[in-house]
């Protein structure tokens, strides 16, 4: 008996060909002998089963002796045992319909659970196999379960249903909801305008829900609603916004936040968090901002960095084109009685530079110049 | 002691421009906002607007926000209002302030007479 | 906007009595437990003097007689006890949304 494996909803041909290469008559019942359909000449005719509408032919092939029974929109309980009878003999096909659905939405959020389900017909004991797009396999019998969903596997999983050593492959577009980078550091000099930036890694039709920006400055004992917010359909829409600082907000997707200058009290880490109509969870992204100021009092040149700065950051004082004069692990540097000319606070990590300030001292007459 | 020094008296004609000063002491100037605050002879009190001086950013109220530049010169810690296309009824005391700790304008300069007339 | 409106517009008070002033505000100025309203005092050819922050709290050298209460839209100053020199016209100020906005005032006379 041959086997064929078909999908659910799609469509399947189950062939029959007679030693003839003419149009003879011929039928396809199931396996309760109720008639699918035949022809009386060159019409088609169709019997009372359950798959009346579904069930074809093509006439086309039927002078070649060929008469293939197509099965559309399959259901899992299509399937069955289809016999073709023509020129006196009968042919058996056993059809097998497979589905596989993932057990929600496709569009999940990062760090959900992935589940997908297979459907087989009474008796199989199909063996399955997907494929992540980012290359990870994951093997299961009815159902499959990845859990902490990443955002490499945003794409189509392939996954293969093994029965009777025949295949069939499914394809299921997954989309992981989530940010572009889960967390991001912006570096900027006392007095300048700070952007924060939130693009998504994906895109949908029609995007709806709401988001808030706590904040949390090095300064304070607690966390603060910046901002709160309303997305509908790609546009925003702020609810709501502190006075100080008042941070003004994009319009249109990507989500951008601009914070009108950066101030040492403004230093601190925030969490951007996005929850999404007819979703559970939310979307999660960290900002941190690091905040430099250069101040000359008297006869002390002071740098100094607020802000969640790691401990290998190198905070350096030095004279324009001249060896630092100060370079520690610190938040803070300072120069006694330094000379005159244009000075610099870097903050670097392994060599490369983060962020710099520059700062004039005059001759000791004079008061400092910050350019 | 933080202080808000204003700019002393102005009379306009109507359409002229006026640019009040206020000049702050006592605390770092870019690390508050600057906001300016209209009353008019005998009435209540109106917000104009805000500046951020560190970066100069400014939010102005969208009844002025067409005759009206907010400004911040930190190198002479100065905050400026400018207003343009002057009519009677910006005849009034213009204020500028600072906040607190809290939410309320703590300090407040002593006001600059505006009167516009022809 | 956020329309403030307060009441009475005037009010005369004996030294050593309560003085009550109210504030309704066009819609809730309350967020994440706080109530954004502050209250000021200001007298003939003087800038407004900041009393009360955040609804209820104190400004730093404002005298304990004066006191702020209320959340979501309705709030209250109260001065108690009543003394001459609180001759003055009171503000309410919603520091919630911009525009920032202040109710048009309440002038307080001793008797």
């Known amino acids: 008996k041959k086997v064929v494996l078909g999908k659910k909803g799609d469509t399947v041909e189950l062939t029959c060909t007679a030693s003839q290469k003419k149009s003879i008559q011929f039928h396809w019942k199931n396996s309760n002998q109720i008639k699918i359909l035949g022809n009386q000449g060159s019409f088609l005719t169709k019997g009372p089963s359950k798959l009346n509408d579904r069930a074809d032919s093509r006439r086309s092939l039927w002078d070649q002796g060929n008469f293939p029974l197509i099965i559309k929109n399959l259901k899992i309980e299509d399937s069955d045992t289809y016999i073709c009878e023509v020129e006196d003999q009968k042919e058996e096909v056993q059809l097998l319909v497979f589905g596989l659905t993932a057990n929600s939405d496709t569009h999940l959020l990062q760090g959900q659970s992935l589940t997908l389900t297979l459907e087989s017909p009474p008796g199989s004991s199909p063996s399955v196999q997907c494929r992540s797009p980012r290359g990870k396999n994951i093997q299961g019998g009815k159902t499959l379960s990845v859990s902490q969903l990443e955002l490499q596997d945003s794409g189509t999983w392939t996954c293969t249903v093994l029965q009777n050593q025949k295949k069939v492959e499914f394809k299921i577009d997954i989309v992981v909801l989530a940010f572009q980078k889960a967390s991001s550091i912006v570096y900027k000099k006392e007095g300048e305008q700070v952007e924060f930036s939130f693009p998504l890694a994906f895109t949908v039709e029609k995007l709806t829900g709401s988001g808030e920006l706590w904040w949390q400055a090095e300064r304070a004992s607690s966390s603060k609603s910046w901002i709160t917010f309303d997305l509908k359909n790609k546009e925003v829409s702020v609810k709501r916004v502190t006075q100080d600082p008042k941070l003004q907000m994009g319009k249109k997707l990507p989500l951008h936040l601009t914070l009108p200058q950066a101030l040492p009290q403004y230093a601190g880490s925030g969490n951007l968090t996005l929850a999404l109509e007819a979703k559970t969870g939310k979307l999660h992204q960290e900002v941190n901002l690091v905040v430099m100021r250069a101040t000359q009092l008297q006869k002390n040149l002071t740098c100094e960095v607020w802000g969640p700065t790691s401990p290998k950051l190198m905070l350096s004082l030095k004279l324009e084109n001249k060896e630092a004069k100060v370079s520690k692990r610190e938040k803070a540097v300072w120069v006694l009685n330094p000379e005159a000319g244009m000075w610099q606070c870097l903050l670097s990590d392994s060599g490369q530079v983060l962020l710099e300030s520059n700062i004039k001292v005059l001759p000791t007459w004079s008061t400092p110049v910050q350019p | 002691q933080v202080q808000l020094v204003q700019s002393g008296a102005e009379v306009k004609k109507p359409g002229a421009s006026v640019k009040v000063s206020c000049k702050a002491s006592?605390?770092?100037?870019?690390?508050?906002?600057i906001h300016w605050v209209k009353q008019a002879t005998g009435q209540g009190l109106e917000w104009i607007g805000e500046?951020?001086?560190?970066?100069?950013?400014?939010y102005s109220n969208a009844k002025f926000k067409d005759r009206v530049t907010i400004t911040a010169d930190k190198s002479t810690n100065t905050a400026y209002m400018e207003l343009r296309s002057l009519r009677s009824d910006d005849t009034a005391v213009y204020f500028c302030?600072?906040?607190?700790?809290?939410?309320?304008?703590?300090?407040w300069g002593q006001g600059t007479l505006v009167t516009v007339s022809s | 906007d956020i329309v403030l409106t307060q009441s009475p517009a005037s009010l005369a008070v004996s030294p050593g009595q309560r003085a009550t002033i109210t504030c309704k505000a066009g819609?809730?100025?309350?967020?994440?437990?706080?109530?954004?309203m502050n209250w000021y005092q200001q007298k003939p050819g003087q800038p407004p003097k900041l009393l009360i922050y955040?609804?209820?709290n104190l400004e730093s050298g404002i005298p304990s007689r004066f006191s702020g209460s209320g959340s979501g839209t309705d709030f209250t100053l109260t001065i108690n006890p009543v003394e001459e020199n609180d001759t003055a016209t009171y503000y309410c100020?919603?520091?919630?949304?911009?525009?920032?906005?202040f109710g048009q005032g309440t002038k307080v006379e001793i008797k």
């Open positions: 302030a600072r906040r607190g700790n809290g939410t309320g304008f703590a300090y």
């Open positions: 006592g605390y770092t100037f870019t690390d508050y906002v």
């Open positions: 500046i951020y001086p560190g970066s100069g950013s400014a």
């Open positions: 819609q809730s100025v309350d967020y994440d437990g706080d109530s954004y």
């Open positions: 955040v609804a209820s």
């Open positions: 100020q919603q520091s919630y949304k911009d525009p920032l906005t």
